[in-house]
């Protein structure tokens, strides 16, 4: 009853000319030990002789005779469990069907294994995850359906020719279930890797190139933007016009929406790649950026700081401290909103210009009663002179003077 024979081995094994093939194999013959083993190449059953015809690569009988010309073929098995085989070197014409003709005392069995030998080393295969997103670690897998103890190989990863060797882990399998060499590369792709070529290179033990596989990376990423402004220094005067342009240098997938932000807040009805600001006012000064979104998320440009320059506004005066006691010190501060900052100040006491006082602050180290009154100022920058504000009142407190009796 031939159903007693149970075999386990890979269905097909792959190799190339000059390499080797290692065939992991187990079997079970319940009626006793193996007495004869013949390894055929492309066996065919001859009905006339009731035997198999074909090239005998290896023969092992009770007498232990082995064809001397087939030293490259080794049966590494035993009489009851192991049927592992090795062919080293393996040749192109070894391709086809290997037939393991097994005979025990009472039973016979022909087990077939497919052998595929190519002329040149075949390429590995790169497997990518279904989606790759920027800055998210992924594992790229390079798989080669080959492994053989007598022919060490290595798989190397390259990004546009630049080695990425340290993050790769190579493993091999030589089991009855599968024969392969696999390299797994842990990789955190950046948006700049999108569209670039990754290579898995098969090399022999001496680092000689054998074959490779290449893939083009499809890295999903938010839109990458550049903002341009006219004028380029983003410094304008009130009433001037400003144009900001948003350019998408990369987006995967395609962008869907565009918006503009000022100081982090979205500008209404500004949904094109150009932002035109006509006759700007000073309250339009601030940090501008464009935001473009795709299915991955929003991308933001760098911020442009728009400075709208204007002449000083009407000034106010702050007094430290009023009322002031005679003999104490007092400081006056002229405050005026302006861009650029005022460079010159004119001070007034009771409407009369104070000579030699051109700074933002006026310091009087020793207050006298006649210092009391209204202080005002005018600020000036390159765009013009501001208006004099209402001023501030200095009250000077002092003890009685020239007391007369009435």
């Amino acid at each position: 009853d031939s159903s007693k024979w149970v075999f386990e081995h890979p269905e097909t094994l792959y190799a190339w000319e000059g390499a080797c093939v290692w065939i992991p194999c187990t079997y079970r013959a319940l009626d006793g030990d193996l007495e004869s083993f013949i390894l055929f190449h492309n066996p065919e059953y001859n009905k006339n002789t009731s035997k198999f015809d074909g090239t005998r690569l290896y023969e092992s009988t009770k007498d232990g005779k082995v064809p001397s010309e087939q030293k490259r073929v080794q049966f590494l098995g035993d009489k009851n469990k192991n049927c592992t085989l090795s062919i080293h070197p393996v040749h192109l014409n070894d391709s086809g069907q290997l037939g393991l003709r097994m005979e025990s005392k009472t039973e016979k069995w022909m087990e077939r294994i497919h052998l595929n030998v190519s002329e040149r080393p075949f390429p590995p295969h790169i497997q990518l995850p279904p989606e790759i997103q920027e800055s998210q670690e992924v594992t790229l897998t390079c798989l080669l359906n080959f492994s053989c103890y007598g022919y060490p190989i290595q798989l190397q990863w390259l990004l546009e020719g630049v080695p990425m060797r340290q993050a790769a882990v190579t493993s091999t399998s030589l089991t009855i279930k599968s024969v392969f060499t696999r390299s797994e590369l842990k990789f955190s792709p950046q948006w700049s890797h999108h569209g670039k070529i990754v290579t898995c290179q098969l090399q022999d033990a001496d680092g000689k190139f054998l074959s490779n596989d290449t893939v083009q990376l499809n890295v999903k990423h938010t839109p990458k933007l550049e903002i341009k402004v006219t004028p380029s220094d983003a410094i304008v005067r009130e009433g001037d016009s400003v144009t900001m342009t948003c350019e998408v240098s990369s987006s995967n997938p395609e962008y869907t929406t565009v918006s503009w932000l000022k100081d982090g807040t979205s500008l209404k009805k500004q949904n094109t790649f150009t932002l035109n600001l006509r006759e700007v006012t000073k309250d339009q000064s601030g940090k501008y950026c464009c935001q473009v979104s795709n299915d991955v998320g929003p991308g933001r440009s760098e911020e442009v700081f728009l400075q709208v320059q204007y002449a000083p506004e009407p000034s106010t005066v702050q007094i430290l401290h009023s009322p002031a006691v005679e003999g104490s010190q007092v400081e006056f501060l002229c405050m005026s909103l302006a861009n650029p900052l005022p460079t010159n100040y004119t001070w007034y006491h009771n409407g009369k210009e104070m000579q030699g006082r051109t700074e933002e602050k006026v310091h009087i180290p020793k207050i006298l009663p006649w210092h009391a009154g209204t202080y005002s100022c005018v600020a000036e920058n390159i765009l013009g002179t501001g208006q004099r504000g209402p001023g501030a009142e200095l009250d000077v407190q002092y003890p009685p003077k020239k007391v007369t009796t009435v």
Partner: antibody
Framework: EVQLVESGGDLVKPGESLKLSCEAS????????MSWVRQTPDRRLEWVAT????????YYSDSVKGRFTISRDNVKSTLHLQMNNLKSGDTAIYFC?????????WGQGTTLTVSS | QLVLTQSSSASFSLGASAKLTCTLS???????IEWYQQQPHKPPKFVME???????YTGDGIPDRFSGSSSGADRYLSISNIQPEDETIYIC?????????????FGGGTKVTVLG
């Protein structure tokens, strides 16, 4: 046979600029990443810069970032290194090297001296 | 930071066995490294690659007397039956790709002297 021939080394003053070139032959230039490696007067080797096979990526050591620019012309099989704002510490023999998995081929080198 | 440490010099008797050490920074102890040799006034030449498990392969024209091994963060270059022509500088090197930044680091080199 792989051949790499560097040129352009010279004696220059600090702050000046210079461009080195490397002519490659005997292999498919556009298939390989290329690098510049220098050897300082104390005989230490220092990696300077690398450019990927078709030039999309450039990488620099911290000591030259912002001052040096590596570029390539795959039609002419030539590698370049533009060096600006040179310092005395840039004095070295500059080697052009092919980067396979490691530096598998080197030129003979060209000498740069930066001195006032 | 990726660092390779080598002793600056080592002396061996003619015909003896030599073992040179290159030590990786502890957080990079699993990295694959390369050994290069450099004769005076010549470019470096690839000698060998050594992986963390000690597996290695040698470059073209490197005699069988050269072998490699590994232990922890140490990568060893061994020379059996050392010969006068082995007297030169041996430099180890290592590459890394962090995010989108490639770097290559060399050790300081070990000057090997063959006595007798």
């Amino acid at each position: 046979e792989v051949q790499l021939v560097e040129s352009g080394g010279d004696l220059v003053k600090p702050g000046e600029s210079l461009k080195l070139s490397c002519e490659a032959s005997g292999f498919t230039f556009s298939n390989y990443a290329m690098s510049w490696v220098r050897q300082t007067p104390d005989r230490r080797l220092e990696w300077v810069a690398t450019i990927s096979s078709i030039g999309s990526f450039t990488y620099y050591s911290d000591s030259v970032k912002g001052r040096f620019t590596i570029s390539r012309d795959n039609v002419k099989s030539t590698l370049h290194l533009q060096m600006n704002n040179l310092k005395s510490g840039d004095t070295a023999i500059y080697f052009c090297a092919r980067l396979g998995v490691y530096f598998d081929s080197w030129g003979q080198g060209t000498t740069l001296t930066v001195s006032s | 930071q990726l660092v390779l440490t080598q002793s600056s010099s080592a002396s061996f008797s003619l015909g003896a066995s030599a073992k040179l050490t290159c030590t990786l920074s502890s957080q990079h102890s699993t990295y694959t490294i390369e050994w290069y040799q450099q004769q005076p006034h010549k470019p470096p030449k690839f000698v060998m690659e050594i992986k963390k498990d000690g597996s290695h392969y040698t470059g073209d024209g490197i005699p069988d007397r050269f072998s490699g091994s590994s232990s922890g963060a140490d990568r060893y270059l061994s020379i059996s039956n050392i010969q006068p022509e082995d007297e030169t500088i041996y430099i180890c090197g290592v590459s890394d790709m962090i995010k989108d930044q490639f770097v290559y680091v060399f050790g300081g080199g070990t000057k090997v002297t063959v006595l007798g």
